[in-house]
């Protein structure tokens, strides 16, 4: 094949070689962009910035190599548009730092920064800590700090991301209330903090003010739905990123609900319960208090991470007519309480009719399916039960 | 498969408190399922101690429960009994076991009171 | 009352059928377990609740109760089924467990 004339060669089925002396000051522009897997480039003197702009439309490019050239200077957000990059190779340049924002988000198998002129700062203390973890090929760099030794000998006691404390009102908050939160941020080389609010949605009306190192949040009429979401501050430095994130907790009566019973290898009498704080639970057994045991007990679904209200069951295995009558769950909370009653009827008297019994309800025959926490069952029977829709 | 293994002391003095530990493989002892005691004196019968549940409740034989206490360490996946006021009436092969069915057992461990 | 009655020795012919029984007030109000033991072992269940059989139990162990008494049949006993035999249920207030006294079944 004839050699290529031009600044920028294809190299294989999605590979680009960039080689000719002095040829590009810039990466715009380059021929089959949006589908280059692998970008080489060397002897690029004029290459001294490499910036948002100039990968865009990269979106599939694994490898990049810039080396023997003039790069001095990567932006925090280069790699924003190449999101799949695995190797970078930024060897022989005039790199005196490199921000810890460039390479988040990525999940770089190998970086090479050998032969740059580094410069030993708190800004290399994520690279220093990249050498001590033995991540992305860097240990065996035995990276240098340019007049200064090596990187892994760089003291970084004072090189810490910033210190974040949030307050918290300490008195109960109502619904409708106004809650006033401050994030208060320390730390040397502040550059900068703010809040993340996505949780929040329609919990509050959210007014943010003030500024580093004193950041405020208020957070006005709040509804009931803000508890269990966080509210989270964050700041940056040329170290790195702090986040911590709170919860308001705002009060609520204990509300309750109870639902039909409903068959499956054991059977289920569903419930709901909400309330902040968390409520207590008691049952009732026509009028009188149930003691739980192995056979009647209460049973919680996993709670979702980010709301208060709690789903279960009353789960009752192998229930007899003995259990039929009225459930009662009484939910308590300081801020209230709440009730819920229902009738269930699990079978007729399977062993005889007894005059002292109540008088149980008739129902026809279904099946069951096994579930987990129960013996594997052999069948040759069919039991007793009722089967019901939960609506 | 759910597996029990129970674990202490095979010999307790009189007026002395036994304990054992029942660890829970191959399952967590959060699940569903409440978890029990169960005895058997030599060459005789068994004897429901107590059970417990994952969330604290519990439930013991009527004879025994001035002196039982079963409890639960989610965190080591296991339950203990302590048995407290021993007497040579309390010699027997102790088993752990899943309730309510008792459809695991642990192989048994056997504790002697005697001085 | 709080107590569940076996007779203590039962015995059949190898092949035969045998029932064991078990007696309490409590039987009118729940099911029985049934549990096989042989010398040195920890109990295995062999039925639970309404006549339910847990996997890897031949299908000639059953279940069955009629007031007081629930019993556990065996159709057709093996010399493998020798061994002691135990029911429980809940008492009669439903707070705690109770065990009867136990059969130990012979195969002749």
């Known amino acids: 094949a004839a050699p290529c004339p031009d600044a920028c060669c294809p190299h294989g089925s999605s590979g680009l070689r960039c080689t000719r002396d002095g040829a590009l000051d810039s990466l715009h522009h380059l021929p089959g962009a949006e589908n280059l897997t692998e970008l080489y480039i060397e002897n690029q003197q004029h290459l001294q910035h490499l910036e948002l702009r100039d990968l865009r439309g990269l979106g599939e490019l694994r490898n990049l190599t810039i080396v023997k050239s003039g790069l001095r200077f990567v932006a925090p957000d280069a790699f924003h548009f190449t999101p799949r990059l695995s190797r970078l190779n930024l060897s022989f340049n005039a790199l005196e730092s490199l921000s810890w924002k460039t390479v988040q988000g990525l999940s770089l198998q190998e970086l090479v920064l050998s032969g740059n002129p580094l410069h030993c700062s708190c800004a290399l203390r994520w690279l220093q800590r990249w050498e001590e973890e033995g991540l992305g090929g860097v240990p065996e760099q035995k990276l240098q700090c340019h007049g200064q030794g090596p990187l892994a000998h760089m003291p970084n006691a004072s090189c810490g991301v910033p210190t974040l404390k949030v307050q918290v009102p300490n008195a109960s908050v109502d619904v409708g209330d106004d809650v006033l939160l401050r994030c208060q941020v320390e730390g040397r080389g502040l550059e900068q903090a703010g809040w993340i609010l996505t949780e929040l949605e329609q919990s509050a009306t959210v007014m943010k003010s003030g500024g580093l190192p004193s950041l405020g949040l208020t957070l006005a009429n709040v509804t009931s739905d803000l508890n269990r979401k966080n509210v989270t501050c964050w700041a940056e430095n040329d170290v790195g990123r702090a986040e911590v994130s709170v919860q308001v907790n705002v009060s609520f009566p204990a509300s309750v609900q109870l639902h039909t019973a409903v068959e499956m290898h054991h059977w289920c009498i569903p419930f709901s319960v909400d309330g902040q704080p968390a409520p207590s639970l008691r049952w009732l057994f026509n009028g009188s208090v149930l003691n739980e045991t192995s056979f009647i007990f209460t049973e919680f679904l996993e709670p979702a991470a980010n709301e208060t209200v709690r789903h279960g069951c009353l789960r009752l295995n192998q229930p007899t007519h003995v259990n039929n009558g009225n459930y009662t769950l009484l939910a308590a909370n300081p801020f209230g309480q709440a009730s819920a009653s229902i009738m269930a009827a699990f079978m007729d008297n399977p062993f005889e009719f007894n005059p002292e019994d109540p008088i149980p309800v008739s129902f026809s025959p279904v099946d069951t399916n096994s579930t987990s926490g129960d013996p594997v069952e052999k069948k040759d029977e069919t039991p007793f039960g009722v089967s019901v829709a939960v609506g | 498969e759910v597996q029990l293994q129970e674990s202490g002391p095979g010999l307790v003095k009189p007026s002395g408190t036994l304990s054992l530990t029942c660890a829970v493989s191959?399952?967590?002892?959060?699940?569903?399922?409440?978890w029990t005691w169960v005895r058997q004196p030599p060459g005789k019968g068994l004897e429901w101690i107590g059970e417990i549940y994952h969330r604290g409740n519990r439930n013991y034989n009527p004879s025994l429960k001035s002196r039982v206490t079963i409890s639960v360490d989610k965190s080591k996946n296991q339950f203990s009994l302590k048995l407290s006021s021993v007497t040579a009436a309390d010699t027997a092969v102790y088993y752990c076991?899943?309730?309510?069915?008792?459809?695991?057992w642990g192989q048994g461990t056997l504790v002697t009171v005697s001085s | 009352s709080s107590e569940l009655t076996q007779d203590p020795a039962v015995s059949v012919a190898l092949g035969q059928t045998v029932r064991i029984t078990c007696q309490g007030g409590s039987l009118r109000s729940y099911y029985a377990s049934w549990y096989q033991q042989k010398p040195g072992q920890a109990p295995v269940l062999v039925i639970y609740g309404k006549n339910k059989r847990p996997s890897g139990i031949p299908d000639r162990f059953s279940g069955s109760s009629s007031g007081n008494t629930a019993s556990l049949t065996i159709t057709g006993a093996q010399a493998e089924d020798e061994a002691d035999y135990y029911c429980?249920?809940?008492?009669?207030?439903?707070?705690?467990?109770?065990f009867g006294g136990g059969t130990k079944l012979t195969v002749l």
């Open positions: 191959g399952g967590s002892i959060s699940s569903s399922n409440w």
């Open positions: 076991a899943r309730a309510p069915w008792f459809d695991y």
């Open positions: 429980n249920s809940q008492a009669s207030s439903g707070n705690h467990l109770i």
